[in-house]
């Protein structure tokens, strides 16, 4: 969380941001507020990029001003036009790359005066894990697979039984590149699986955390997944 | 070349499948958003799926349940999945790009036609 | 869902006459995510315009494209025989994700 004051004369405004994470492949938000301003045409809005001349987008007097726009951002960019009344300037990006990652600018004039704040916008993959049970093995194993994650992530497993122990000797993990050469596909196996037990395989680089829950017993198998954004 | 190649239309009677295929030569379908886009015989154009760059798909609510968007990144192929085929999909079907510039590649069209 | 109405319906034109087509959304379009088509009978789309104003690859540049928020424009300086089309504004972003007009028929007077 990054809080921005501008000072112009005797007026100032908030500007808050939130360190944002950007899935590669998707749209992503950086997120930025403001102090809310009724004059709508009287809000300017300025994204900007770290080592880019140009703008990454401007909306003033109610609308878009792409004419400083630079071309790495063009086509791909939107603030969310409705909400800017009420102190909303994030902005929408499409098709997130892992070079859109840096150091972004908001920056805000009302009014009421003016602001700018950081934002640090992190770029990488990440995907819910998916754990099966592996009938095909010698014994009992669990299958833990993520489709894409970047940068590599670490794996480990834990369980509800034997809380604090170490799986690593039991278990075995691999990553395989996709074909889009980026981003790659996480399979961790965990050997010699007990019977009414939950087992967990978190998954976890610097932008994401995932884990995969899966309980087996005679009768059933029940699984939970959740994906968590760091930093943000 | 950029290029985009559909195939697998044809005609089928209601409540029946089909699955279509776009064939893409010159980029690499998993970088890009891809979508089918369809136009009813006399009409406008319609949008019907998007697969995104991360794998994850998205349909018009006309379809939704009943189509299915994917694709074979080793085979650099879109396909569509069509279950439960209506009188109202009757259309040709668009496999397009959007390169963050619009849809900006597009093939030549399938056509589907469902009659009994 | 945001619904582009593109009006006129039908155009009927001379060539060598400037062409002004209309798209209106019925709320606000980021001007990066709005686009332009040409289709020609038995053929697929082409892309005219993106990001509201920019010309796409090979579009020459008596085709050009203006506007923000709810009305855009796609204006065609001098008619040229092959420019007779059906021309289709489309908008990206909102459900469903992509949103095209109806179309406005460009034909010979």
């Known amino acids: 969380l990054i809080i921005g004051f501008g000072i112009s004369g005797k007026h100032f405004i908030t500007v808050t941001t939130f360190t944002s994470a950007g899935n590669i492949g998707e749209d992503g938000t950086l997120s930025c507020t403001f102090e809310p301003d009724i004059k709508l045409n009287g809000i300017v809005i300025q994204w900007l990029k770290e080592g880019i001349k140009g703008l990454v987008h401007e909306f003033k007097e109610g609308k878009d001003d792409l004419s400083q726009q630079h071309e790495m951002f063009r086509g791909r960019t939107a603030v969310f036009a409705d909400q800017v009344v009420v102190g909303n300037a994030s902005l929408r990006l499409k098709n997130v790359q892992l070079t859109d990652a840096g150091t972004y600018t908001c920056y805000i004039r009302t009014s009421k005066g003016k602001g700018n704040a950081n934002l640090e916008y992190k770029t990488g993959a990440f995907s819910m894990p998916e754990i099966n049970v592996d009938y095909n093995a010698s014994s009992e194993s669990l299958r833990c697979e993520a489709p894409r994650w970047f940068p590599q992530p670490t794996v480990a497993w834990a369980s509800q039984v034997d809380q604090g122990a170490n799986f690593s000797e039991v278990s075995n993990t691999s990553f395989e590149l996709n074909s889009e050469n980026v981003t790659m596909k996480v399979v961790s196996v965990l050997y010699n699986v007990t019977i009414n037990n939950t087992y967990s395989c978190m998954i976890e680089n610097d932008i994401a955390k995932a884990t995969g829950d899966i309980k087996v017993t005679d009768s059933e198998v029940k699984r939970r997944s959740q994906l968590q954004l760091l930093n943000s | 070349e950029v290029q985009l190649v559909e195939s697998g239309g044809g005609l089928i009677q209601p409540g029946g499948s089909l699955r279509l295929s776009c064939a893409a030569s010159?980029?690499?379908?998993?970088?890009?958003?891809m979508n089918w886009v369809r136009q009813a015989p006399g009409k406008g154009l319609e949008w019907v799926s998007v697969?995104?760059?991360?794998?994850?798909?998205d349909s018009a609510d006309s379809v939704k349940g009943r189509f299915t968007i994917s694709r074979d990144n080793s085979k650099n192929t879109l396909y569509l999945q069509m279950n439960s085929l209506r009188a109202e999909d009757t259309a040709v079907y668009y496999c397009?790009?959007?390169?963050?510039?619009?849809?900006?590649?597009w093939g030549q069209g399938t056509t589907v036609t469902v009659s009994s | 869902e945001i619904v582009l109405t593109q009006s006129p319906g039908t155009l009927s034109l001379s060539p060598g006459e400037r062409a002004t087509l209309s798209c209106r959304a019925s709320?606000?379009?980021?001007?990066?995510?709005l686009a332009w088509y040409q289709q020609k009978p038995g053929q697929a789309p082409r892309l005219l315009i993106y990001?509201?104003?920019s010309r796409a690859t090979g579009i020459p540049d008596r085709f050009s494209g203006s506007g923000s928020g709810t009305d855009f424009t796609l204006t065609i300086s001098r008619l040229e025989p092959e420019d007779f089309a059906v021309y289709y504004c489309?908008?990206?972003?909102?459900?469903?994700?992509?949103?095209f007009g109806q179309g406005t028929k460009l034909e010979i007077k």
């Open positions: 397009a790009r959007d390169a963050d510039y619009g849809l900006d590649v």
């Open positions: 010159g980029f690499i379908v998993s970088r890009n958003y």
């Open positions: 697969i995104y760059g991360s794998g994850r798909t």
């Open positions: 709320q606000s379009v980021s001007s990066s995510y």
């Open positions: 990001g509201a104003s």
């Open positions: 489309q908008q990206y972003g909102s459900s469903p994700l992509y949103t």
